[in-house]
Amino acid sequence: CKAMHVAQPAVVLASSRGIASFVCEYASPGKATEVRVTVLRQADSQVTEVCAATYMMGNELTFLDDSICTGTSSGNQVNLTIQGLRAMDTGLYICKVELMYPPPYYLGIGNGTQIYVIDPEPCPDSDF
């Protein structure tokens, strides 16, 4: 069967510092040496790219310097962390995996992780 299944958690709650982490795992139908992982955000019918990284199997996952994402890879599993999240960023975050090399190319798209972000309450002023 020429299919690549991608699994990710259904729901994640971001920390009070606006950081959310989740695992994206894929069942590879081929022996890929180069893999691309993209995080997409779907809000209503709009889809935007949050971040993307290409990595060689066995090497570390490297996002661009200005990316809000960081991650590590281990086999067919990618641990993703998204930083700087605010309440308005609450939404469905979809993990997309592409086996880029060698051919054939394979595409796998997860069902998405609903990330909930709650802005922290400002600390009340203290009188001493």
Partner: antibody
Framework: QVQLVESGGGVVQPGRSLRLSCEAS????????MNWVRQAPGKGLEWVAV????????HYTDSVKGRFTISRDNSKNTLYLQMNSLRAEDTAVYYC???????????WGQGTMVTVSS | EIVLTQSPGTLSLSPGERATLSCRAS?????LAWYQQKPGQAPRLLIY???SRATGIPDRFSGSGSGTDFTLTISRLEPEDFAVYYC?????????FGQGTKVEIK
């Protein structure tokens, strides 16, 4: 608005070469895989080639391997198809098409006609 | 290579009728799209992921199916729906299209 505009088609003799261009506008070109799809007169659609993101990874249909080369210039938002050793069976309308984030081809150019004839 | 076979080759229907188009794959397909093409025009994406409507596509178009059997349904044909429809698999290379189904006015 988001659009793709092809150019470079024409009439060429068998064995000769032609280069097609596809200029993209209205979106972040480097974030998408780009494809060439062709349609022979009165026939169906045939995928020809794809090039990914930074241009390092490319795939071709078997019938054009070794003859056609897909490339892109992200600084110019332009996709290319260099066609060498052209054959009569390469006669078709050539479309460039963007692969949506979810993989399907959501934006297509208007097409450019390539006729290979002596 | 995954071979997609569409049926019927031609569908003769009247406006207002329901159209059911089939696409069968030679092996299991993970991602399938449907396109509409009118004479002299580029194809237009209708459905992706077997059942998700593309932006701006009317809800009379719906897709269903999984594995090797997929269906495009047009609930009530409008005059502008008479065209050729193609299915495509895009889960693995090489990307392949079906041979097309022509929906014509009866």
């Amino acid at each position: 608005q988001v659009q793709l505009v092809e150019s470079g088609g024409g009439v060429v003799q068998p064995g000769r070469s032609l280069r097609l261009s596809c200029e993209a506008s209205g979106f972040t070109f480097s974030s998408y895989g780009m494809n060439w799809v062709r349609q022979a007169p009165g026939k169906g659609l045939e995928w020809v080639a794809v090039i990914w993101y930074d241009g390092r990874n490319k795939h071709y249909t078997d019938s054009v391997k070794g003859r056609f080369t897909i490339s892109r210039d992200n600084s110019k938002n332009t996709l290319y198809l260099q066609m060498n050793s052209l054959r009569a069976e390469d006669t078709a309308v050539y479309y460039c098409a963007r692969a949506h984030y979810f993989g399907a081809f959501d934006i297509w150019g208007q097409g450019t006609m390539v006729t290979v004839s002596s | 290579e995954i071979v997609l076979t569409q049926s019927p080759g031609t569908l003769s229907l009247s406006p207002g009728e329901r159209a059911t188009l089939s696409c069968r794959a030679s092996q299991s397909v993970s991602y399938l799209a449907w396109y509409q093409q009118k004479p002299g025009q580029a194809p237009r994406l209708l459905i992706y992921g077997a059942s998700s409507r593309a932006t701006g596509i009317p809800d009379r178009f719906s897709g269903s199916g999984s594995g090797t059997d997929f269906t495009l349904t047009i609930s009530r044909l409008e005059p502008e729906d008479f065209a050729v429809y193609y299915c495509q698999q895009y889960g693995s290379s090489p990307w392949t299209f079906g041979q097309g189904t022509k929906v014509e006015i009866k």
